[in-house]
């Protein structure tokens, strides 16, 4: 395929592999994909450090890379026609394996907007500088390359493989060699964590003599979220060494018998697991599994636990985290209910105030009460509100309908009220006549 697995780092529930080879981004992704992974994500500073570690491992084994500034593909790409979004940490790029946008980014320089071709991201390594945790590889954006033409300074790529869980490395209580074969077809003798479904071949012996024993184990799920090999007791034990070789392969304490045999044991507060090697805390609450203010409560025999929430909170679907109880769903208030963290409060609608019989009750506010009326003239209280009225010759005015404004009867909608002259007055009007004319008894006509 033009790529060699040179390095592997397994941590948490993922393994990262670094490969050297001048491949295009598509070829690199295809290589990762064939073994069940994707080009690596770098979604946090922690993940950036894992990727840096696997690259450092690769560089220690790689004789000489051709470019001082070497680039390694990761799984961040932007499709053709999708434009740059400077407001986002990933600038419109997305991870090839899918998943949400993440806040972490480490761009090498300001990105140029270009929507006409697909763009891919690589990690930029300055090989003249040592790789330090404080100096994480920068993200460099550019063309994705094509078969035979990977792009300038592309020296390899990083894959990521995710797993249900990991097994602890097998502990040898005497001379021997363990070889792990991972589901992504990498063989290694030194893994900090070994992914689920890996095989382990154990060859016991000094190496120069014929090997006396060999064992085969699979990393499997022994019980929910418990990943183990199913081996019982330390492997390759030798009376010649007793507890002196690798602490007898024991996780904590090793106790020797007089006949060269030995047993593993645990410190106070821990118990020996079925593998007779590993120790686990007796108190499952010691790992603080409960979140969000939840208290960890031990179950019978101290084997299990449940999480308990404070007043006004309840466990979410994970049964580990506390979420606020929405007390308003039970309609405890007469009118408005406002949910608050750990509780609730009742509020009244406009025109009502707290009061009356019962918890959370509301009563009408008498807006027309003495000294309180918002109206310029007449005020009538209603349930939850009020309305203003005006004396004859005035109409309600103002944005809130509380003011009274004189009606200009001289420009009334029915046309002129007077035959000749019309004089508007506060709340009324009167008619007049031109010189030589007299106002008739009806107060409207001129004679």
């Amino acid at each position: 395929t033009g790529a060699d697995t040179e390095a592997v780092v397994c941590v948490g529930t993922a393994c990262y592999t670094a490969h050297s080879g001048k491949l295009s981004a598509a070829e690199a992704q295809n290589h990762c994909n064939q073994n069940g992974g994707n080009l690596a994500t770098v979604k946090s500073k922690e993940e950036a450090q894992h990727v840096q570690r696997v690259l450092a491992q690769l560089l220690r084994r790689e004789a000489a890379l051709t470019a001082r500034m070497s680039k390694f593909w990761i799984g961040l790409q932007r499709e053709k026609g999708k434009c740059l979004d400077p407001s986002l940490p990933l600038k419109g790029f997305s991870w090839v394996g899918g998943g949400e946008d993440t806040p972490y980014s480490n761009w090498h320089k300001e990105l140029r907007n270009s929507c006409i071709s697909k763009r891919c991201v690589s990690l930029l390594l300055d090989l003249s500088q040592p790789l330090l945790p404080s100096r994480l590889p920068k993200w460099s954006e550019g063309p994705c390359g094509s078969p035979g033409s990977p792009g300038s300074n592309i020296e390899g790529f990083v894959c990521k493989f995710s797993f249900k869980g990991m097994c602890r490395p097998l502990a040898l209580g005497g001379p021997g060699q363990v070889t792990y074969t991972t589901p992504f077809q990498t063989t290694s003798s030194s893994l900090e964590a070994v992914p689920f479904a890996s095989a382990a071949n154990v060859a016991c012996g000094e190496g120069d003599k014929d090997e006396t024993q060999s064992h085969y184990f699979l990393c499997k799920e022994k019980a929910p979220d418990v990943f183990d090999w199913g081996s019982s007791g330390p492997l390759c034990v030798s009376p010649k060494y007793g507890c002196n070789f690798n602490n007898g392969g024991c996780h904590q304490d090793c106790f020797e018998g007089g006949d060269g045999s030995f047993l593993c044991g645990c410190r106070p507060g821990f118990r020996l697991l079925d593998d007779l090697v590993t120790c686990a805390s007796r108190n499952p609450c010691s790992s603080s599994p409960c979140r969000g203010g939840a208290t960890c409560v031990l179950g019978p025999h101290g084997k299990n636990y449940t999480c308990r929430c404070p007043q006004g909170y309840q466990l979410d679907s994970s049964q580990l985290d506390c979420v606020d109880v929405d007390e308003c769903q039970d309609s405890p208030c007469a009118q408005e209910c406002v949910n608050t963290p750990g509780g609730f409060r009742c509020e009244c609608w406009v025109g009502y105030e707290p009061g009356g019989p019962g918890e959370g009750a509301c009563q009408d506010v008498d807006e027309c009460a003495l000294g309180r009326s918002p109206c310029a003239q007449g005020c009538t209280n209603t349930d939850g509100s009020f309305h203003c009225s005006c004396e004859e010759g005035y109409v309600l005015a103002g944005e809130d309908g509380t003011q009274c404004q004189d009606v200009d009867e001289c420009v009334g909608p029915g046309g002129p009220l007077c035959d000749s002259l019309c004089f508007n007055t506060q709340g009324s009007f009167h008619c007049g006549c031109l010189p030589g004319w007299v106002l008739a008894p009806n107060g409207v006509s001129c004679t």
Partner: antibody, heavy 118, light 112 residues
Framework: QVQLVQSGPEVKKPGESLKISCKAS????????LNWVRQMPGKGLEWMGR????????DYNGKFKGQVTISADKSSGTAYLQLSSLKASDTAVYFC???????????WGQGTLVTVSS | DIVMTQSPLSLPVTPGEPASISCRFS???????????LYWYLQKPGQSPQLLIY???NLASGVPDRFSGSGSGTDFTLKISRVEAEDVGVYYC?????????FGGGTKLEIK
Amino acid sequence: QVQLVQSGPEVKKPGESLKISCKASGYAFSSYWLNWVRQMPGKGLEWMGRIYPGDGDTDYNGKFKGQVTISADKSSGTAYLQLSSLKASDTAVYFCVRGDGYWAMDYWGQGTLVTVSS
Amino acid sequence: DIVMTQSPLSLPVTPGEPASISCRFSQSLLHSNGITYLYWYLQKPGQSPQLLIYQMSNLASGVPDRFSGSGSGTDFTLKISRVEAEDVGVYYCAQNLELPWTFGGGTKLEIK
């Protein structure tokens, strides 16, 4: 489709031993736990033990340890339950059951009736 | 070992009526991953048991939706919304959180 086919009924005398088989098909035999469950006449279900055929790893219920041996042959996709020093109280139906990825016992064999009588 | 108590021992039901079976465990079956490892099986007369509910509330493939499972860390309930004649048999609850796996004593559902 997934199938577990068990060997036929057995009648044994006290003190004898017996090996029941369970032939699996329709799934990756090596990658799933294979359990054995006992049901005494008119009684409930009891988990006896299990095997992971991929590497032969076994776990036993303490109640049955020493009396039963579980084994598997990857090449033929067959699991075995060996019962030694049979007693009348071993008279029961023995089921082989696949354990799935949700820790459920999702596929059951038809059961093998073992009668121990002098 | 985790011990469970199933009740009632026997449950006579009229077809079309609902039915409810309880199961109580000696310790919580809630794992720190948020999953409850409680299962329900039905053994019809003369047959092998069959899986009904996995991980407390999930319906197994091919099981009618009149069956439902619920509960907390130690107390669980299997409900049948409307019992049908084909539902007769012995119902078992089981835990697969901690070895050895254990089953409840069983509840015999019969038609009135």
